[in-house]
């Protein structure tokens, strides 16, 4: 049988073991109603997720446990999340302190990596936005996505500035995923 | 010849058939001027797309027809879209009804999956944002992207809350794509 | 040994040479403080990037030089960037000219392709947003990502409407990446 991988590529290269794409670690998690939980004083609270119902899934040894996606294999991963926020602001931008405009309210999403051997979490991605809508109910998403080199055993989580503002009503509005490239 | 795929991976694994990356179904579609079309009363209208001019392409049996991307092969796909909206709002946030702030205008993008064997479309991704700009011409994008397990024969489309607000002037502002991982 | 790639796929197919995923060109670049540089009058200025410290990396012949990511191999790439902007606007939306609302301030990110054989850049992706916040310090991200067919030797850069508004304080807020699919 003709084996395509025996062709000589146009540039000199040492091939790592080949593997089928279908067996790579992958996960897409979707929002659930958040239960109030403790979080460290200087750290934004982490969201927990649905990992098997509806559109959500984990596969090929990518596991979800206790707010964390567990990375089962070292490599380059594309990691993404969208969080839809909703709230009610009261003319925040018109309040002035000492003659200067006030610091507006904001919404923030952080995708964080935790490595057991390292005490401090690493912020991989941050989306942060000031919110200053004049007297209205507002809602808006923050989307993040990028590629990172992760190690087997790394853990990923999504932190937000205010859990009470997260829209948990629909699985297509707030989600979190990762896949090995 | 040294065959990389014969190396023993660090974990026990059954390999699915290998395949070259270059032959995977892929598409990147770009915006065109929308012609007014009928849509179901309770469903947002679907956009139609350029699929072969400029930056747009479909390849490896991924076809575009009648507003739909047709999935030719089961597997995990990364799906993305950006829609740039533009409009003119008139101080909507300052109108109060019965002493409460009004529900603001909004813009919404939904990436929807249609399966012939199932009557109801599935919303995969939604980006929705309140728009309440005080007396100005406004414009802004909504970006979405995530991974989903799709079946051969599934169809994907992009629905928006208001076609007349979609910026169709540049192919880099409003687009829709998918690729098999 | 059972070689998975000898299985007959469900559709007739000629396989291109297979290659390990780990040896594909990839890069994730992160923000640095920008030094004022010249740029062409009609073109937005390009950002320069960190390519090896912290979360930033380039690998497998994908190189970064002088604001450009160099594409070492033809193929389909997923390209992404987020730029976080921050600024201070002064009630711009309430200034009216000749009874009509003024054109609002805006922020724009463009991912651009440059081909040596052709002087004119091709805009691949654009995210553009009006900014009209009433008297406040504001901040917000623009995220972009999509798939493009690139040729060996192509160069990618990120241009922004105003370099002085780019938030360069954290590597997770403003970034740019690409990887061969």
């Amino acid at each position: 049988a003709l084996k395509g991988q025996e062709f000589a590529p146009s540039h000199q290269q040492v091939y790592a073991p080949l593997r089928a794409d279908g067996d790579k670690p992958r996960a897409h998690l979707t929002v659930v109603r958040q239960t109030p939980t403790q979080h460290f004083k200087n750290q934004f609270p982490a969201l927990h997720w649905e990992h098997e119902l509806g559109l959500a899934f984990t596969k090929n040894r990518m596991n979800y446990t206790n707010k964390f996606l567990l990375i089962p294999e070292s490599g380059d991963y594309f990691i993404y999340s969208q969080v839809t926020f909703r709230g009610m602001t009261s003319e925040c931008s018109e309040i002035r302190q000492a003659g200067r405009p006030n610091k507006p309210d904001s919404i923030t999403v952080v995708i964080t990596k935790v490595t057991d051997s390292y005490p401090e979490p690493t912020q991989l991605l941050m989306g942060t936005k000031s919110v200053c809508e004049v007297g209205s109910n507002w809602f808006q998403p923050i989307y993040l996505g990028a590629m990172f080199s992760l190690q087997e055993g790394d853990k990923l989580m999504v932190n937000v500035s205010d859990i009470s503002l997260v829209d948990y009503t629909k699985e297509d509005k707030t989600f979190f995923g990762a896949f090995l490239l | 010849a040294l065959k990389g795929q014969e190396f023993a991976p660090s974990h026990q694994q059954v390999y699915a058939p290998l395949r070259a990356d270059g032959d995977k179904p892929r598409a990147h579609l770009t915006v065109v001027r929308q012609t007014p079309t009928q849509h179901f009363k309770n469903q947002f209208p679907a956009l139609h797309w350029e699929h072969e001019l400029g930056l747009a392409f479909t390849k490896n049996r991924m076809n575009y027809t009648n507003k739909f991307l047709l999935i030719p092969e089961s597997g995990d796909y990364f799906i993305y879209s950006q829609v740039t909206f533009r409009g003119m709002t008139s101080e909507c946030s300052e109108i109060r009804q019965a002493g409460r702030p009004n529900k603001p205008d909004s813009i919404t993008v939904v990436i929807t999956k249609v399966t012939d064997s199932y009557p109801e479309p599935t919303q995969l991704l939604m980006g929705t944002k309140s728009v309440c700009e005080v007396g100005s011409n406004w414009f802004q994008p909504i970006y979405l992207g995530a991974m989903f397990s799709l079946q051969e024969g599934d169809k994907l489309m992009v629905n928006v809350s208001d076609i007349s607000l979609v910026d169709y002037t540049k192919e880099d502002k409003t687009f829709f794509g998918a690729f098999l991982l | 040994a059972l070689k998975g790639q000898e299985f007959a796929p469900s559709h007739q197919q000629v396989y291109a040479p297979l290659r390990a995923d780990g040896d594909k060109p990839r890069a994730h670049l992160t923000v640095v403080r920008q030094t004022p540089t010249q740029h062409f009058k009609n073109q937005f200025p390009a950002l320069h990037w960190e390519h090896e410290l912290g979360l930033a990396f380039t690998k497998n012949r994908m190189n970064y030089t002088n604001k450009f990511l160099l594409i070492p191999e033809s193929g389909d790439y997923f390209i992404y960037s987020q730029v976080t902007f921050r600024g201070m606007t002064s009630e711009c939306s309430e200034i009216r000219q000749a009874g009509r609302p003024n054109k609002p301030d805006s922020i724009t990110v463009v991912i651009t392709k440059v081909t040596d054989s052709y002087p004119e850049p091709t805009q691949l992706l654009m995210g553009t947003k009006s900014v009209c916040e009433v008297g406040s310090n504001w901040f917000q991200p623009i995220y972009l990502g999509a798939m493009f067919s690139l040729q060996e030797g192509d160069k990618l850069m990120v241009n922004v409407s105003d370099i002085s508004l780019v938030d360069y304080t954290k590597e997770d807020k403003t970034f740019f990446g690409a990887f061969l699919l």
């Epitope: - | 001027r33 400029g54 | 091709t122």
Partner: antibody, heavy 124, light 107 residues
Framework: QVQLVQSGAEVKKPGASVKVSCKAS????????ISWVRQAPGQGLEWMGW????????HYARMHQGRVTMTTDTSTRTAYMELRSLRSDDTAVYYC?????????????????WGQGTTVTVSS | EIVLTQSPATLSLSPGERATLSCRAS??????LAWYQQKPGQAPRLLIY???NRATGIPARFSGSGSGTDFTLTISSLEPEDFAVYYC?????????FGQGTKVEIK
């Protein structure tokens, strides 16, 4: 500036094949498609087909389907049109033309740059 | 395929006169119609794209109008160099098709 330079005139016998080349310069070759148009002596313009220089996708006029093949080589920025099983009524000037696309959903553009033409004579 | 019919086949006019050329499509092509000029022994030249947009370097005396199935190319005041054959082309559906041409000749 944008330029399309075609290969030289050809004289062919009926049943033979001809392959005309079109070398592009002065623009991003992979962004703009290439159309091939022919013009028989004293006749009007006839569109033969289009190829995407971006990914090689083609559209051919029905009357040429099966007899024409359009290809590109991005490394040399060259488009090719091969016509097989030539007949005397294939005698014509063959043009390549750049399909301008303005990068806007509002426009479909037009063929804004043309090669100088290649005369193909089919005669026994 | 979409058939384009141009009229008249020949237009005999004097320099300075106004020329009106018509192109009718067998079905709607929206605004996706282009006009070309061809002089003897030369390659065609794009004049108008998307029904009404002048291509780069085309003088203002050339204008296009129409949408759907009926289109017009107007030359407001003929110059000596404008005497040539003019073709319309639809770009709405594959295969692209040309009209048979209108010859504008000196009266």
């Amino acid at each position: 500036q944008v330029q399309l330079v075609q290969s030289g005139a050809e004289v062919k016998k009926p049943g033979a094949s001809v392959k005309v080349s079109c070398k592009a310069s002065g623009y991003d070759f992979t962004y703009y498609g290439i159309s091939w148009v022919r013009q028989a002596p004293g006749q009007g313009l006839e569109w033969m087909g289009w190829i995407s220089t971006y990914n090689g996708k083609t559209h051919y006029a029905r009357m040429h389907q099966g007899r024409v093949t359009m290809t590109t080589d991005t490394s040399t920025r060259t488009a090719y049109m091969e016509l097989r099983s030539l007949r005397s009524d294939d005698t014509a000037v063959y043009y390549c033309a750049r399909e301008n696309y303005y990068g806007s959903g509002a426009y479909r553009g037009g063929m804004d740059a043309w090669g100088q033409g290649t005369t193909v004579t089919v005669s026994s | 395929e979409i058939v384009l019919t141009q009229s008249p086949a020949t237009l005999s006019l004097s320099p300075g006169e106004r020329a009106t050329l018509s192109c009718r499509a067998s079905q709607s092509v929206s605004s996706y119609l282009a006009w070309y000029q061809q002089k003897p022994g030369q390659a065609p030249r794009l004049l108008i794209y998307d029904a009404s947009n002048r291509a780069t370097g085309i003088p203002a005396r050339f204008s296009g109008s129409g949408s759907g199935t009926d289109f017009t190319l107007t030359i407001s005041s003929l110059e000596p160099e404008d005497f040539a054959v003019y073709y319309c082309q639809q770009r709405s559906n594959w295969p692209w098709t040309f009209g048979q041409g209108t010859k504008v000749e000196i009266k």
